[in-house]
């Protein structure tokens, strides 16, 4: 764009150099050239000469009018055709921008990743504004009434050191640009309720060589949180549908989870946890792929057929992936829930 230009005259924009997308816009060019009575005044947008909707107002001034201007950015300049000059003479130039006032930020969420030392807040910014937009995060203690503000672009990390005076806060986000300002809804935050346990990792898996082979998945976390609730999802690499198994975990030792799976198949496993009774989940762990061993017996085994299943408090549900290319972004699509697991002694993950 045009940042520094020596003008021999003036250029101005109505309603202003930054305006709402879709507005009608008038751009004026006024020459102040020495030794030139211009025959014509020309307008250029992004280097291309404009042909239409140009009005000569008087000897020194012309205007170009745009109906419903909808380009996010353009650089305009105007020139004069001076008698006796081979080339047009530059008068002035301006960068112009169009955009939208911000939407109110939505889906404000704040979490503390265990050991991070930060409260991380994220939100949806809404539709693109096309112009520079700032986000101001307000954090107000409900106990001391002290308010802090943080400037952000799309998320903010606030050191928990600056949140020492209180456990309960009100958090909201202001979106600000030159066309307007909107506030998010206020979020009530209790620091003890938003901790996400330290990442859970699947370290290895093995399939036993029994008559009915079972796969044992070993997983761990460095969390210090005592009561943790976890989900492990698994599927064959060729399948779209995940099965999900739920666990109450105690990470003072490595967790072992048993599965009765199709033989000679490649499975992918992922795990995620939350503090029991809280609402914020870890992201799913990195996919862990395990190949089950070839079937040794001749029985055509059905994973969920009797007599291998008995009722339990654990849950296995069916979840369908939206896209096989996005293993981290899954959605519950079906409501098929199977409460049960294959019987084989004590499977309650007692390490």
């Amino acid at each position: 764009g045009i940042t520094s230009i020596n003008c021999s005259g003036d250029m101005w924009v109505e309603p202003g150099e930054i305006f709402q997308m879709g507005m009608n816009v008038s751009i004026y060019c006024q020459e102040a050239l020495k030794h030139c009575r211009p025959r014509n005044l020309y307008f250029y947008k992004n280097g291309f000469k404009e042909e239409f909707d140009i009005t000569r107002i008087n000897r020194t001034t012309a205007r170009i009018w745009y109906k419903g201007f909808s380009e996010p950015h353009a650089y305009m300049h105007c020139t004069a055709e001076c008698p006796g000059h081979f080339q047009e003479t530059l008068i002035c130039g301006k960068d112009i921008s169009s955009g939208h006032p911000p939407d109110a930020p939505s889906n404000l969420t704040c979490v503390i990743y265990e050991y991070s030392g930060n409260m991380t807040c994220t939100w949806n910014t809404g539709k693109p504004t096309y112009i520079d937009t700032k986000y101001i995060v307000h954090v107000k203690s409900l106990e001391t009434e002290e308010e802090q503000q943080y400037l952000a672009s799309s998320y903010v990390k606030i050191s928990t050191d600056s949140l020492q005076g209180s456990r309960k806060y009100l958090v909201w986000v202001q979106a600000v640009n030159s066309l307007g300002m909107e506030n998010s809804q206020q979020l009530h935050v209790h620091l003890d309720d938003i901790v996400i346990p330290s990442a859970s990792i699947i370290s290895r898996a093995e399939t036993t060589n029994d008559t009915v082979p079972k796969t044992i998945v070993y997983w761990k976390s460095k969390t210090m949180i005592e009561k943790v609730f976890c989900e492990m999802r698994y599927k064959t690499t060729t399948n779209q549908t995940w099965s999900v198994k739920e666990f109450d975990a105690n990470f003072t030792y490595v967790q072992q989870s048993e599965f009765y799976l199709e033989p000679d198949s490649k499975y992918v496993f992922q795990v995620r946890c939350q503090e029991t009774g809280k609402r914020n989940w870890q992201p799913w762990s990195s996919p862990f792929v395990h190949q089950t061993s070839q079937e040794t017996g001749k029985r055509n085994w059905q994973p969920w057929s009797s007599p291998f299943v008995h009722q339990t408090s654990q849950t296995v549900s069916q979840v369908t992936a939206k896209s096989s290319h996005e293993p981290q972004k899954m959605e519950m699509l079906s409501a098929t829930i199977f409460r049960g697991h294959p019987a084989s002694g004590n499977h309650q993950d007692i390490g």
Epitope: I131, T133, K134, I136, Y150, L151, A152, K157, N177, S178
Partner: nanobody, 116 residues
């Protein structure tokens, strides 16, 4: 750490004008997003005007067309020219320096009182 010092407040009749100044020291204020804020008694601090980027300034609806934000790089100073003042503009006015991800730093404030 940046230090901010406001000045220029005072008492004025409705319809009058004031020019507030905010001088920054101890920091390259060019890396700040500078703003003017105000707090009336018993109310929350509110954003009055903010320099969003070059050539782009936010003004609260209540001050649009009456207040003008400007800056003087050489003096590390920003200004708020307040014209056509109204009694509802009475408040403590603060300037703030915000940098991405950091806590906003405030000046001590300067009192503006508009009487009818």
């Amino acid at each position: 750490q940046v230090q901010l010092q406001e000045s220029g407040g005072g008492s004025v009749q409705a319809g009058g004008s004031l020019r507030l100044s905010c001088a920054a020291s101890g920091y390259t204020y060019s890396s700040c997003t500078m703003g003017w804020y105000r707090q009336a008694p018993g109310k929350e601090r509110e954003l009055v005007s903010m320099l969003i980027s070059d050539g782009s300034t936010f003004y609260a609806d209540s001050v649009k067309g009456r207040f003008t934000f400007s800056q003087e790089y050489a003096k590390n100073t920003v200004y708020l020219q307040m014209n056509s003042l109204k009694p509802e503009d009475t408040a403590m006015y603060y300037c703030g320096c915000a940098t991405l991800g950091s806590r906003t730093v405030w000046g001590q404030g300067t009192q503006v009182t508009v009487s009818s």
